[in-house]
Amino acid sequence: APVRSLNCTLRDSQQKSLVMSGPYELKALHLQGQDMEQQVVFSMSFVQGEESNDKIPVALGLKEKNLYLSCVLKDDKPTLQLESVDPKNYPKKKMEKRFVFNKIEINNKLEFESAQFPNWYISTSQAENMPVFLGGTKGGQDITDFTMQFVSS
């Protein structure tokens, strides 16, 4: 069977939503009412990888776009980017490791750890309107905890 993909939105633990900021960047900010329609809808694919009760490997694409969150080294630092792919070949069960995140849920907290760079997480800043990035610290100033709202296709 082909890879299963479900639509969802994410909010960080401060209730900031994720929106597009230019063609290849996401930012986090508080949205209300009609503005909630601006939030990015992800197509989350359940991909191949090491799995446990608390950890599920996923890829995060942007709904109806050939863009996926990926983790690469830039200037020797693990970096989050939006990468364009060939829609004829994606999503797939065996995604390249840079596209894979371990969705980890423990005690009402949801984290997305890079499979390529263990202990690096999708992160947001405390400040409003700042880019979503890959962070190497948990429990500090930056936010690594999210909630997820699945939405109908």
């Epitope: 479900l6 009760n53 608390d54 599920i56 009402n108 949801l110 999210f146 997820m148 699945f150 296709s153």
Partner: antibody, heavy 119, light 107 residues
Framework: EVQLVESGGGVVQPGRSLRLSCSSS????????MSWVRQAPGKGLEWVAY????????YYPDSVKGRFTISRDNSKNTLFLQMDSLRVEDTAVYYC????????????WGQGTPVTVSS | DIQMTQSPSSLSASVGDRVTITCRAS??????LNWYQQTPGKAPKLLIY???ELAEGVPSRFSGSGSGTDYTFTISSLQPEDIATYYC?????????FGQGTKLQIT
Amino acid sequence: EVQLVESGGGVVQPGRSLRLSCSSSGFIFSRYDMSWVRQAPGKGLEWVAYISHGGAGTYYPDSVKGRFTISRDNSKNTLFLQMDSLRVEDTAVYYCARGGVYKGYFDVWGQGTPVTVSS
Amino acid sequence: DIQMTQSPSSLSASVGDRVTITCRASGNIYTYLNWYQQTPGKAPKLLIYNAKELAEGVPSRFSGSGSGTDYTFTISSLQPEDIATYYCQHFWRLPYTFGQGTKLQIT
């Protein structure tokens, strides 16, 4: 023995609220995604709410979105469904079920609690 | 939403008969399909998941098959306790939806 027991159903007027509970036993509740599935009188089954094992993920179909809220208390092995702005068409038996989005199936069910919305 | 259509809506059969129920999806669901049994006045019970895998404790007379949009549920030798309504349910895309049910009676 693995068991789910629902409570909180009853008769309520349109526009009012009701809160259902589901108590679990016989398995480690905090490790399982949970759902509510309803069955209108003489009708089929409809999945109406989902919550992930830790509570960080939720899902509602369009028919109840914005009116129903699912939550859980893992320390008390209990699942909840807060139903607001109830409509006549919400009349159904409400089942608590183990499972949801990821595995896709519901492998343990409660006996159900009836909810009647009528003026 | 993907619609699930079961046929027949009801059927009668004798003890020992082979019984087949079909479920058709409005789009390809790639074997992401489950089957449930609901006996009168009781909660549903999972019988088959992933189109063909038997759930724990379910007798081997129950089986499932199919791919694409068309799926089949079979009872190889009908027993009196199999009197129930049977439902299919897909889990390919949200929302996951159930078929309308097939009511099985014994003649």
